[in-house]
């Protein structure tokens, strides 16, 4: 490329006309401020191309950079673009006008910048000052560019004198932006909404002043755009939030909502997505199984838990035998329903120091205007077994009988065992089972009664012993799901002149025997 006159700097007179020519091996064009100028283009016979730019009636506003470049200059090397700077000294034009982009200079790091105050006359002396300040700052000036240096976050003006008048430039604002890596968080007021309700999502980025938010959402894909609102969040600068609000949601608004945040300075970006479900109407759904029969142990506390999903938030009621339950002032019952996630709930009924009377039919009902669900179960109060009586007798028939009576819930099992060697029993010798195929000749009769009022079973078992020829330790053991209890009696033969009986508690025995219940001999009777 060849420019005539060659420059690189020309000083032209105001009101004059001037012709510039650019030639090259391909079509060439004159540009100023990235705009093509009115010009005459030609092609010579020797296959050279030229463009003639005629500048007429020049004013100070024509001062600036002019470029000659190949017509399709994309990807061309810098030396395939020629620059010419023209000054048109004009006393009526002070500083050349700037657009807003030039007046506000944003930085992201400490770096050299240029305050672009330019004059039309290269002979003028230009000084830089803080806005409303008189002291000139020691910063180098280039008439074609302005003042270049490292500047603090302040506002600055340039001054010059044209003739006898002092002229000020516009103020230039230097401001350091806060930029950091981007970490986006997205949340929704609700991730489940009914049709007709609003969807409101928030996308938050912290620590950046230069961010662009872009939302992707189902409605956008169908060409229905929603204008997000950007605002500030919390009591902190640079917590910036973009809010996407979709009023009156439709079923088609279900899907993935993505917030993409970009920061153009360092080319950082991040995005987060959230799923929104629009339902036709509300719902309540039980999660997991709760058995139809539940258990609680007498005098212990028991919490019964039901897990369910619901939207919108439901009302939860508990009933016992069709009567509504509430938190009792005595603290015997506690009801609570808590939200463990947006649509998941746990409802708990806590019975404190369970009483027999609290057995019965329980129901939890969760409902709102669109749906309801209920769950019922029977609560059984388990009572640890107690041996209430162990007695020995000598009927006239000559046999000896031992009677054992006990209670508990659920129904207790009874185990009879005996030990001959009183000195070594039960620590050293295992007891032998009675009532079936033991070497003792014995018979067993067991009756079971259910007492409705106390809601427990009573077991009465009678052991008949045919031939007792030496003292025998007989033990009655009762067991159920929540415990065991035992008592012992010493049975002596008829022939002995004295009868010695001793009741021995479980603790005295100092060991646990592994015994098998002789259930096939039990006869159950319910009253």
């Amino acid at each position: 490329l060849v420019i005539t006159p060659p420059g690189p700097e020309l000083i032209l007179n105001v009101s004059s006309t001037f012709v510039l020519t650019c030639s090259g091996s391909a079509p060439v064009v004159w540009e100023r401020m990235s705009q093509e100028l009115p010009q005459e283009m030609a092609k010579a016979q020797d296959n050279t191309f030229s463009s003639v730019l005629t500048l007429t009636n020049l004013t100070g506003l024509d001062t600036g950079e002019y470029f000659c470049t190949y017509n399709d200059s994309r990807g061309l090397e810098p030396d395939e673009r020629k620059r010419l700077y023209i000054f048109v000294p004009d006393p009526t034009v002070g500083f050349l006008p700037n657009d807003a982009e030039e007046l506000f200079i944003f930085l992201t790091e400490i770096t050299e910048i240029t305050i672009p105050c330019r004059v039309t006359d290269p002979q003028l002396v230009v000084t830089l000052h803080e806005k409303k300040g008189d002291i000139a700052l020691p910063v180098p000036y280039d008439h074609q560019r302005g003042f270049s240096g490292i500047f603090e976050d302040r506002s600055y003006i340039c001054k010059t004198t044209i003739g006898d008048r002092e002229v000020d430039s516009d103020a230039y604002y230097v401001y350091r932006l806060q930029v950091s890596s981007i970490n986006v968080s997205v949340n929704a007021v609700q991730t489940v909404v009914r049709q007709g309700e609003n969807i409101t999502l928030m996308c938050i980025v912290i620590g950046n002043e230069v961010v662009n938010f872009e939302w992707m959402y189902p409605r956008k894909e169908s060409g229905r755009l929603v204008e997000p609102v950007t605002d500030f969040l919390l009591d902190m600068p640079y917590h910036i939030r973009s809010i996407l609000h979709i009023p009156s949601a439709e079923l088609e608004d279900s899907g993935t909502y993505t917030c993409n945040v970009t920061e153009s300075v360092n080319d950082h970006q991040d995005e987060k997505a959230i799923n929104i479900t629009v339902v036709e109407s509300g719902y309540v759904r039980l999660l997991g199984e709760v058995g139809a029969l539940q258990f609680a142990e007498l005098h212990r506390s028991r919490t019964l838990q039901v897990v369910f999903e619901a939207y919108p938030p439901p009302t939860v009621l508990w009933f016992k035998d069709n009567r509504t339950l509430g938190d009792s002032s005595a603290g015997e019952i506690a009801l609570s329903t808590r939200n463990v996630s947006e649509t998941r709930y746990v409802s708990e009924l806590t019975l404190v120091r369970v009483k027999v009377a609290e057995a019965g039919h329980y129901t939890m009902r969760a409902f709102h205007e669109d749906a309801e669900v209920q769950l019922s179960f029977q609560l059984q109060i388990n009572v640890p077994v107690r041996v209430l009586e162990l007695s020995e007798s000598h009927p006239d028939s000559g046999e000896q009988t031992v009677r054992c009576r006990g209670r508990g819930m659920p129904q207790p099992n009874i185990i009879w065992s005996a030990c001959r060697d009183l000195k070594r029993c039960p620590r050293e010798l295992p007891p032998m089972l009675l009532g079936n195929s033991s070497e003792e000749e014995s018979q067993l009769e067991t009756n079971v009664t259910y007492w409705e009022e106390e809601q427990e079973f009573e077991v009465v078992s009678t052991l008949r012993l045919q031939h007792v020829d030496r003292p025998l330790s007989v033990r009655c053991t009762l067991r159920n799901a929540v415990g065991q209890d035992m008592q012992e009696v010493i049975v002596v033969p008829h022939s002995l002149p004295f009868k010695e009986q001793k009741l021995i508690s479980e603790e005295d025995l100092g060991g646990e025997q592994k015994l098998i219940s002789e259930e096939d001999l039990h006869h159950h009777h319910h009253h």
Epitope: P97, D99, E102, F104, D170, L177, T230, S264
Partner: antibody, heavy 127, light 107 residues
């Protein structure tokens, strides 16, 4: 010298109209947002309206929406406020001001305040 | 609209005193807050922008602080020229709102 000179204030009847003018000098008017601010007698300042450099964005306080219109002529370095359907409560001294709103950096604007103000012009709405 | 509440409404002080005026926003405005001084019959004068940046030509005894919803203007070492009315002003989403003003008078 950077300055804003106002004109157009007067006494007007309720329901009447008035146009206020504000002429800039000493700075590149076309590079700045501009605002109108008013002050009722003995009261505080109330922002009324603002306008972007090329008139592509205009904003108003709720109480004047639909009645007032802000405009500008960059060639004449002038800002205007057309006031229609005036009410007694519009009585105030009206100020024009240069509003330092830089071009957008990302999705929101920065702000540096109103640094140059006109001398004010009194609008009295009374029958 | 964002509401700006200044306190106190009136403040009596003496030359040389250090005074503080508070401004609260009804919602977070980051640090987009300016402070102005106005004398009777005059246009307001910008003192502070961006909550804490001192406008050129304003004496260094004026300072601003705060972000989010709570802001303060402090004048350390009151001068006779400082007795005036002070206004805070927020900028957010294109609109502006002024506080109701604090009149600083001589005690």
């Amino acid at each position: 010298e950077v300055q804003l000179v106002q004109s157009g204030g007067s006494l007007v009847q309720p329901g009447g109209s008035l146009r206020l003018s504000c002429t800039a000098s000493g700075f590149t008017f076309s590079s700045y947002w501009m605002s109108w601010v008013r002050q009722a007698p003995g009261k505080g300042l109330e922002w009324v309206a603002n306008i972007q450099q090329d008139e592509s964005e205009k904003y108003y306080v709720d109480s004047v929406k639909g009645r007032f219109s802000i405009s500008r002529d960059n060639a004449k370095k002038s800002l205007y406020l057309q006031m229609n359907s005036l009410r007694a409560e519009d009585t105030a001294v009206y100020f024009c001001a240069r509003d330092l709103v830089p071009p957008r950096q990302g999705d929101y604007y920065h702000y540096f305040g109103m640094d140059v103000w006109g001398q004010g012009t009194l609008v009295t709405v009374s029958s | 609209a964002i509401r700006m509440t200044q306190s106190p409404s009136t403040l009596s002080a003496s030359v040389g005193d250090r005074v503080t005026i508070t401004c609260r926003a009804s919602q977070s405005i980051s640090d987009w807050l300016a402070w102005y001084q106005q004398k009777p019959g005059k246009a307001p004068n910008l003192l502070i922008y961006k909550a804490s940046s001192l406008e050129s030509g304003v004496p260094s005894r004026f300072s601003g602080s705060g972000s989010g919803t709570e802001f303060t203007l402090t004048i350390s070492g009151l001068q006779p020229d400082d007795f005036a009315t002070y206004y805070c002003q927020q900028y957010n989403s294109y609109s502006r709102t002024f506080g109701q003003g604090t009149k600083l008078e001589i005690k």
